[in-house]
């Protein structure tokens, strides 16, 4: 495949990545699938600088990111190491709260109204952010 050198229409370029910001809500798994179908992934936050960029674009709205612990350990969807990576949890979070009454705890991470992170029930219909890296091989065939 060819290398992607510029962002698709309606995506925002920042630091060699492209970002797409939803304006509707989906459950985490559906948001994750949406990004994958766009040859992208839910946003993976690797620095304070990237955190500020995303926060600026989403505003004070609950928004899914590509971090979950649905199988036990916290994992970023692109394989970035959680343990050594950037974290921006709200105080007292993550708390795997069971009191919501929906069954199970809270396994998916989202940006809260102040940008810091919280874990929540993955079925909640929050907005989401997709990310894809420039210079990575595209799934599309090259133009001849």
């Amino acid at each position: 495949g060819s290398e992607r050198t510029c962002c698709p229409v309606n995506w925002v370029e920042h630091e060699r990545s492209c970002y797409w910001f939803s304006r509707s809500g989906k459950a985490w798994a559906d948001a994750d699938n949406y990004c994958r179908l766009e040859d992208a992934h839910l946003v993976v936050v690797t620095s304070w600088e990237e955190q500020k960029f995303v926060q600026h674009h989403i505003g004070p709205v609950n928004t899914w990111m590509g971090l979950h612990d649905q199988n036990g350990p916290w994992k970023w969807v692109d394989g970035t190491d959680y343990e050594t990576g950037f974290k921006n949890w709200r105080p007292e979070q993550p708390d795997d709260w069971y009191g919501h009454g929906l069954g199970g705890g809270e396994d998916c991470a989202h940006f809260t109204d102040d940008g810091r992170w919280n874990d929540d029930v993955c079925q909640r219909p929050y907005r989401w952010v997709c990310e894809t890296e420039l210079d990575k091989a595209s799934q599309e065939p090259p133009l001849l």
Epitope: D69, Q70, N71, G72, P73, W74, Y82, E83, K87, W89, P91, E92, Q93, P94, D95, D96, W97, Y98, G99, G103, G104, G105
Partner: antibody, heavy 115, light 107 residues
């Protein structure tokens, strides 16, 4: 590599107290809820208590409520179980385990309550 | 509280056999259930989480299925190292509850 190591078990008389510890390593301890599970000799597994990552939420089995206290020290990557008013039926191997889905377990520590 | 029952409580099988263990919940727990293997004198080990997802490093001969109130653990071809006791666990709501266990021994 995730590791959980329990300690503090031993022989104690009925009515006595014991404090179990679980030393955690290989993961960001404060990001995970933790649990105590026990197994009486020759019996099945019994969930005892859980605590969320920042100690906001704490849960106990009815069989230990009011007698056992779960706590954690995230600075020391350690989980604790303070056991008071011990009874013969508390005799068991006590395991610590990570998260609600119990993905990693320690090797266990034996608590024997006998006169 | 949610009660978990397991059947059978024990079974005898031979290497190569297909083994199925059933776990039932007293109320619906979606897919919030795990399966654990325990050998004598050892800590339990997670095999399956979320009813059907295989734990990393666990052989593919183990599989889980089910949702709601009825769940199964299947070992497609029993190996010598699989003789052990198997427990299900619901972590849908507190108090968490284990099934009573199924002991798989040599026929």
């Amino acid at each position: 590599e995730v590791q959980l190591v329990e300690s503090g078990g031993g022989l104690v008389k009925p009515g006595g107290s014991l404090r179990l510890s679980c030393a955690a390593s290989g993961f960001t301890f404060s990001s995970y809820s933790m649990n105590w599970v026990r197994q009486a000799p020759g019996k099945g597994l019994e969930w005892v208590s859980s605590i969320s990552g920042s100690s906001t939420y704490i849960y106990y089995a009815d069989s230990v409520k009011g007698r056992f206290t779960i706590s954690r020290d995230n600075a020391k990557n350690s989980l604790y179980l303070q056991m008071n008013s011990l009874r013969a039926e508390d005799t068991a191997v006590y395991y610590c385990a990570r998260v609600a889905a119990f993905d990693y377990w320690g090797q266990g520590t034996l608590v024997t309550v006998s006169s | 509280d949610i009660q978990m029952t397991q059947s059978p409580s024990s079974l005898s099988a031979s290497v190569g056999d297909r083994v199925t263990i059933t776990c039932r919940a007293s109320q619906g727990i979606r897919d919030i259930l795990g399966w654990y293997q325990q050998k004598p004198g050892k800590a339990p080990k997670r095999l399956i989480y979320a009813a059907s997802s295989l734990q990393n490093g666990v052989p593919s001969r183990f599989s889980g299925s089910g949702s709601g109130t009825e769940f199964t653990l299947t070992i497609s071809s029993l190996q010598p190292e699989d003789f052990a006791t198997y427990y299900c666990l619901q972590y849908h709501s507190y108090p968490f509850t284990f099934g009573p266990g199924t002991k798989v021994d040599v026929k």
